[in-house]
Every structure is written in C-alpha cells, then in structure tokens.
Interface confidence: medium
Amino acid sequence: GCLSQLYANTFFRGGDLAAIYTPDAQHCQKMCTFHPRCLLFSFLAVSPTKETDKRFGCFMKESITGTLPRIHRTGAISGHSLKQCGHQLSACHQDIYEGLDMRGSNFNISKTDSIEECQKLCTNNIHCQFFTYATKAFHRPEYRKSCLLKRSSSGTPTSIKPVDNLVSGFSLKSCALSEIGCPMDIFQHFAFADLNVSHVVTPDAFVCRTVCTFHPNCLFFTFYTNEWETESQRNVCFLKTSKSGRPSPPIIQENAVSGYSLFTCRKARPEPCHFKIYSGVAFEGEELNATFVQGADACQETCTKTIRCQFFTYSLLPQDCKAEGCKCSLRLSTDGSPTRITYEAQGSSGYSLRLCKVVESSDCTTKINAR
Amino acid sequence: IVGGTNSSLGEWPWQVSLQVKLVSQNHMCGGSIIGRQWILTAAHCFDGIPYPDVWRIYGGILNLSEITNKTPFSSIKELIIHQKYKMSEGSYDIALIKLQTPLNYTEFQKPICLPSKADTNTIYTNCWVTGWGYTKERGETQNILQKATIPLVPNEECQKKYRDYVITKQMICAGYKEGGIDACKGDSGGPLVCKHSGRWQLVGITSWGEGCARKEQPGVYTKVAEYIDWILEKIQSSKERALETSPA
C-alpha cells in the first residue's frame, strides 16, 4: 500500500541505486517516486562533518523486501516512494528555496523584477529545468535581479550551496503551467536525425512519447517499428534533443514514427503510465515473480499491486496454463522498459499502473448524495 | 507568380493551397478544385513527401498569413499520382487528391470546369495563371494570391526554346517572348485557366520552367485536356472501390 510518512534523523543503509542533489526531502521523495526502481530514499538536510558535499544529497534506494535497515543519523530524513499512492502522485514541484543556489549549466541570464517572473521565464523556456534568482540584496551588484536559467543531464541540480540572497526553484512545466504550446503531431514514416539522449524499448510510438515526456532532456523522439530493417533497432524509441529546441527537418523513413515530448502541454500531458495491453507481444526483462491468474487484466492488476513490478507478460501457451489460470510473469529492468520485445501469438504484455494518478476502482471519488 | 498582381477574394475560387505540416507548416504547391472531393495538382509536389497524413489543403483562402491553427483544412484520403510519372523527367506531372470529407461549395470555394478531350486543339486567348509562389527566381512565398495573364505558346515554338528538353503533346507552354511574367517556385500544381465561350476552364497545371519569367523561356504546364480519360477513370474507380467497401 501507500506509505507516505517521513522518518526524521533516519538513514536507510544499503540498497543504493543513484544519488542526486535535491533542495528538500519532499523533492527527493518525488524523484524517487518517478525513478523506475526506487522504493526508498534518504535525504541529508545537514552535512556530515568533513563531508560538506553530501549536504542536500538524495540517495535513492531499492530493496527486494521493500524495506532496508535504518540507522540513526542527525539531519537525515528518509521515506518511501509514493509509487502506490494514487492521488498523491504528481511531478509538479512549486516550492521556492530561499538562500539556496541550485547549480547546473547556466544557459541564459536575464534581468527580471521578481522570483515569480524568473520562474515563469524558466517554465516557458524549452530547455530550462530549474533556476536561480539573485535578489536586489545580493552581494554582487552586477547580478542583482538576475534570473539564471539552468539545466543538467539529470534534470536536477549538479550541486546545491547555501548562498545569501539567492532564491532557487524548478520549472513548472510538470505542473502544466507552460505557455510554450503542445505539439501533438505524430509523423508516420519520418525520422528526426538529431542528438540521441537515450533509447529504450517500447511497443509503440505512444509509449515512446510518454517515456520522452518524462525524461528530463527529451524534447522529441523517433520510434522504429517492428518492420524496421535493422533488427537491433526494432521497437526502439530514440529520445532526442537539439540546441535549438526544435528538431531538424525530418528525414523520410519507412517504418519510423516521430513526434514531440508533451512535457510543455497543459491539458494533454499524459500520465507516466501506459494502460494498453498488447496482445501477441512478449516483454522481456528481469523476472521478479510468476503467478497464475485468469486473464491479462488480472495479470496487469497483479503487477500494479506488486510494487517492484514494472511490466508483465501473460502467457496462454498450454504448458503455461493450470486450473487456476495461466502464467503471469512479473518483470522489471533498470530503466522501466522491456529489454526486448518479441512477437508471440499466445502472449499478452503490458505495464504496471503503479504510477497512474487514479487506479481504477468501483469506488467513486466524487459521491452524489441523495437529497 | 512573377509580374503578377494581387487577386481579390473569390476571384479564383477553385485555387487551393497545399501545405505540409511537419516541424512547421509551409505552403508547398497550388491545386484546383474539380469536384466536391477532388483536387487536381502536379505529381512533383509529392516527390519529397509522398505521405498523405502530413498534407493540409486550404480552400476559399486569399491571404496565407491569415491561416491559423483554427483555420479549417481538408486532409487527403487518397493520393493518386500518374502511374507513368517519374520525377527525373517532366512528363505525366499530374496527380489527383481525394479529400477525406467533401467540400461545401461557397462563392469563395467552388470547382473549375475541365476541358473536354475535343479541346486539345482549342485556341485559347484569355488565359491566367495564379498562385502564392515566388515573385522572382530567388524569392519567397507570397501571402496574397497573385494572378497574371499570359499567352499560350505553340508546342513547336516552345520546343525550339527548350532544345535540351522534350516538350511532349501532354504539355502546354505559356509565356511572353520578352519574359517578365510567369509562374515560379511554389506555384507548381496550381491552375492555368482560360476563359472560353463564357466560362473558365482548367487548361494547364503549373509544372516547370527554366528559371522564372526569363526571356525566350516560357512556362511549361501539364495539358489537362490530354488527361481527361485518366482523370475520369481514376475518379470512377475510386467511387467503385468506395461502393465495394461500404456496408450493405
């Protein structure tokens, strides 16, 4: 179930997945929630003696059992990911951090009259992930009322330092507040030849688009279908970027599909989950568990309830079926996407719905009361 | 159009703008409405981009700069490029577009008459070419639809001007000996219309030329009268296919 409590002066030992810098524990929890494998986190609000660079460190962790040994550590805050917390799921982070310099690659500097205006500039700049604003009391006069737009390869600061009269915050694109616009076009038979930031295996261009939307540096994508001539690139989703923020003119290419990230959308922003079940398809990955259930929908439900499960394959092969149902293989990978997709008539595959805002249930959230 | 003037709204109601929506949206070619669901244009417009789903067709438009993302457009249901067309030659430069949904005819958007097969030898005297193309060889697309009157040039004479190319009987030429008025880049696929016996007919489809409006280098157009059978056959076979697939 959903575990939203935070543990003060507590640090989880072991299970390390990744370490990043975040300005507070809430932001660290958010980063853990949207990381494909993170289940637990520990955040250092104060720096250990002699290790000043560890302050603001957010340590993302995983565990087979769902828990890790706790050790006492002053100034540490630990907690769980909110992967199974339905309504609490949001990538939006509106907090402003006074006295902090969130460092990254400064790609734009301009004068603005307020922090709000600076945050708006960042929200409406395609490349901006976070920002730092120097107030009118900042010690260097030439930087006063300066708005620095920043980015990094992870989408989070490369370091965080306490500096008086600096204020930092994040882009509000994930809050659906960007005014950049929402290019929903999908180009059949076109490929973008721009810089690849990453690639993942996906069953279709729509999943590719959602992956792109939630990747910190993906602006557009090209997906190669199962008919693509190079076998190693079939069902591969290339996440792309460019200096200009726009793709170069697309190349005509049969069996390629291209489109844009929807991270600047206001209404059409997708959820970080994929509802569709793909019949005739098998998703390969690290095996977590196998159970026997009746139907692919039940298999998806099992995967969703198993916190570490990222995707599943349901097999209807005679040797995979028993009286209580057929084999439901729960799987995971380092990036949350299948390591390979194969086409098998007797299989159905899909994804966990653990990151869906509203996991469908018969209980209505809005009740209509009889008068 | 080089040496042309601004048109007024509804003056050439059959003229459409064929635009491509990729990273940005751009006018690529002209076309002519010949039926509620049919546009006639040049095959070479689709050379680089033969995928129907990226094309948008705007009718009843005078000023391209007034097109916004709210402006209604038609989409391509079927693209029929002449089977003998090769982009490495100028011949058979003709294509039919079947629209997803039929057009509503208005005073600003209605069809142009096709000539009959018997019109292959008709002598036309009042001919006009229209389009949003360049106004000079190294120019840019125009916002307001341009028009220019232009005399037809006999094929034998045209062939003499184009010694390096074959001017076939499926082509028709138009232009002034001294140059100065012609179709240009971006006018491709658009209409060359002539008023004959009181009504406008689609005589040519803008196809190619040596530069634009050069002296002794007339514009070359696809001669529509030579393709009447092909046009009618394609429209008919499309209707028959639609009947086969419609529910009983």
């Epitope: 190349i251 005509i252 | 690529m28 070619c29 070479h44 417009c45 050379d47 680089g48 982009m87 490495s88 030659e89 100028g90 430069d93 193309g133 010694r163 390096d164 190319y165 074959v166 179709a183 240009c184 880049k185 971006g186 006018d187 491709s188 803008t206 196809s207 190619w208 030329g209 040596e210 530069g211 634009c212 070359v220």
Partner: antibody, heavy 126, light 107 residues
Framework: EVQLLESGGGLVQPGGSLRLSCAAS????????MIWVRQAPGKGLEWVSY????????TYADSVKGRFTISRDNSKNTLYLQMNSLRAEDTAVYYC???????????????????WGQGTLVTVSS | DIQMTQSPSSLSAFVGDRVTITCRAS??????LNWYHQKPGKAPKLLIY???RLQSGVPSRLSGSGFGTDFTLTISSLQPEDFGNYYC?????????FGGGTKVEIR
C-alpha cells in the same frame, strides 16, 4: 546498363594540351547533360565543366575557364574535354558523369551526378 | 562561390553504429544538396540527391535531411562496405562545389 568510359589521359608537359573522351552507352545520351569532375591525388572532388544535352550551353569552373573546352557529339554518344595550357595543378583523375534531371517546385535542373566513369589520370609534369 | 563545409573530416565507428555526417553551405541552397560515396581507387557513387532522396539501389539505412544551409547524412547502422570517403555537393548554382569530404573508417 549505363556505362561511361573515359580515355585520353596521360603525361603531358606544362603548357601542353590533351583531349579527353568519354564514351557513353546504355542510355539516350542526347537527352542528358554531362559533366567533368576531377580529383587531384589525395584530395577532394572538384567540378570542372558542364554541357547541356544539345551542347548549346556550357559552363566552367574559374580555375579552367579560357583553357578548357567541353563539347559533345550526340551522334557518337561521346563527350570531350579539350585541355590547353595545362598546369601542374591540373594533375588529377578526370571523371565524366551524367547529370540527373530533377523537377522540384517548378524548377527543372540538371541537379546531381548519377553515373560516373572510372576516371582517367592526367599528369602535368616536366 | 558557395563554400561547402563538411564535419567531421574523419570518423571511426563500429559496425552497427549510427553515423551522422553534416554539411553546411555558406548561403542557402534550398534542397539542392547531393551526397556521394567514394572508395579508394574507385569513382564516386551517388547516394542521395535533393537533400533527402535515396538514389535507386542505395540501401535504406542511409538517409539525408536538411534544407537551406544545414544538411545531414545518416547511416543508421554502419556496415563494413560503408567505409571510404563521403562528399556533399551543392548544385544550387555554378560553380557546383563539393565539401572537403569525410573519411569513414570501420573500427
């Protein structure tokens, strides 16, 4: 099958002359523009000259203008390059190539070189 | 004259790698850009014309894009036979000019 075969290359002294020929087969020679391109040893490609199908229009690179003459004999399916006042910097492999016609956006251009001969070496040296 | 600048001047890649070569024109040339491949001691071979059109017989792992001044040749999955020199060439106006070439080696 389109074939282009150059001949006439060889060693020549500075100030001397050579005439290169290119025999064409497998296509209607009289319908295509033809091009000469050269490549100095270990260097890149350099366009030299171009002739229209009828032979009525020719163009040259500045480096050869006034010294080289391109011509064709459509009855013999042959392209020629007459090279006079040769210089050491004219040393190169000379290729003849066919110009492909491209119709795009109302422009019909001999726009790309779709078939090439195997080349003939011209060495200008004393 | 229009200058054509190719980059990189040489590259070394593994079989299966995605390779991108860029070509920049000193002034806009619409789509009048062609790509050729030349193996040592052989004549050049046309790969792509009009910026993005694949010459018949050329494998579809090769593709071209661009318009105006910036152009790209992409080999989606490098094969052993793809080694050699690649040249871009503009035919917007005479004199037709070539890029300096990109030497592609297989690691």
């Amino acid at each position: 099958e389109v074939q282009l075969l150059e001949s006439g290359g060889g060693l020549v002294q500075p100030g001397g002359s050579l005439r290169l020929s290119c025999a064409a087969s497998g296509f209607t020679f009289s319908a295509y523009s033809m091009i000469w391109v050269r490549q100095a040893p270990g260097k890149g490609l350099e366009w030299v000259s171009y002739i229209r199908p009828s032979g009525g229009r020719t163009t040259y690179a500045d480096s050869v203008k006034g010294r080289f003459t391109i011509s064709r004999d459509n009855s013999k399916n042959t392209l020629y390059l007459q090279m006079n006042s040769l210089r050491a910097e004219d040393t190169a492999v000379y290729y003849c190539a066919r110009g492909g016609l491209l119709l795009w956006n109302r422009e019909l251009k001999s726009n790309y070189f779709d078939y090439w001969g195997q080349g003939t070496l011209v060495t200008v040296s004393s | 004259d229009i200058q054509m600048t190719q980059s990189p001047s040489s590259l070394s890649a593994f079989v299966g790698d995605r390779v991108t070569i860029t070509c920049r024109a000193s002034q806009p040339i619409d789509n009048y850009l062609n790509w050729y491949h030349q193996k040592p001691g052989k004549a050049p071979k046309l790969l792509i014309y009009a910026a993005s059109r694949l010459q018949s017989g050329v494998p579809s792992r090769l593709s071209g894009s661009g318009f105006g001044t910036d152009f790209t040749l992409t080999i989606s999955s490098l094969q052993p036979e793809d080694f050699g020199n690649y040249y871009c060439q503009q035919s917007y106006t005479v004199p037709y000019t070539f890029g300096g070439g990109t030497k592609v080696e297989i690691r």
